[in-house]
């Protein structure tokens, strides 16, 4: 379970498609 | 203005821990990602660990997962890297670095004046 | 997974220098190129392929496709004489450098 605290925060993974991007990298979604 | 300033390297022996810090100033902390990026003497980059905005969000190199440790303090706009169980193949220059602003932060814009660390017994 | 560049690349004073950077489906991915000048730290000076920071001269440029990443800079100063490093992720876990390139300007 995430921690309360971080539950506002983005969270960034690495994938393809992602972010309006038509490539791969990192990408960060709250 | 913008900056990133290292501190904690040294001399350690094999085995043994050093923790490192890297103060920020010049920008909101909290917003942005971080990283610990080394380079061995006379050789190229090497990508250590990041950091984003959650703690709970960090990931590793292979090369270091389970002897280091990042983290962040933001009340104190502070980087860390506790390094563990070193290694002869962990000397190297240690840089902090900003990873960029906004949704999709692939590079790395600001950097700090690094700091060495040399494992030798 | 592994970034290869030239060890080395000569130019003359105001001619154009061309940096590459191989890597398996490179093109697929958002490539970086860093300036690192002697007893200096690296500098950010092409981001997501070719937009350049704040900054950074006109003069340098970027591209990627295939399976190649290009570092271009045109009418190269004495002062772009340097290191150069490329940069991508490939996976959460695994951010890739280019072994690096001395740019030495003849």
């Known amino acids: 379970r995430r921690r309360r605290r971080d539950t506002h925060f983005p969270i960034c993974i690495f994938c393809c498609g992602c972010c309006h991007r038509s490539k791969c990298g990192m990408c960060c979604k709250t | 203005q913008v900056q990133l300033v290292e501190s904690g390297g040294g001399v350690v022996q094999p085995g043994r821990s050093l923790r490192l810090s890297c103060a920020a100033s010049g920008f909101t902390f909290s917003s942005y990602g971080m990283h610990w990026v080394r380079q061995a003497p006379g050789k190229g980059l090497e990508w250590v660990a990041v950091i984003w905005y959650a703690e709970s969000n960090k990931y590793y190199a292979d090369s270091v997962k389970g002897r280091f440790t990042i983290s962040r303090d933001n009340s104190k706009n502070t980087l860390y890297l506790q390094m563990n169980s070193l290694r002869a193949e962990d000397t190297a220059v240690y840089y902090c670095?900003?990873?960029?602003?906004?949704?999709?932060?692939?590079?790395?814009?600001?950097w700090g004046q690094g700091t060495m660390v040399t494992v030798s017994s | 997974y592994e970034l290869t560049q030239p060890p080395s690349v000569s130019v003359s004073p105001g001619q154009t220098a061309t940096i590459t950077c191989s890597g398996d489906k490179l093109g697929e991915r958002y490539a970086s190129w860093y300036q690192q000048r002697p007893g200096q730290s690296p500098v950010l000076v092409i981001y997501q392929d070719s937009k350049r920071p704040s900054g950074i001269p006109e003069r340098f440029s970027g591209s990627n496709s295939g399976n190649t990443a290009t570092l271009t800079i045109s009418g190269t100063q004495a002062m772009d004489e340097a290191d150069y490093f490329c940069?991508?992720?490939?996976?959460?876990?695994?951010?890739?450098f280019g072994g690096g390139t001395k740019l030495t300007v003849l």
């Open positions: 670095a900003r990873a960029q602003e906004g949704i999709a932060p692939d590079a790395f814009d600001i």
């Open positions: 940069q991508a992720w490939y996976s959460s876990t695994n951010v890739l």
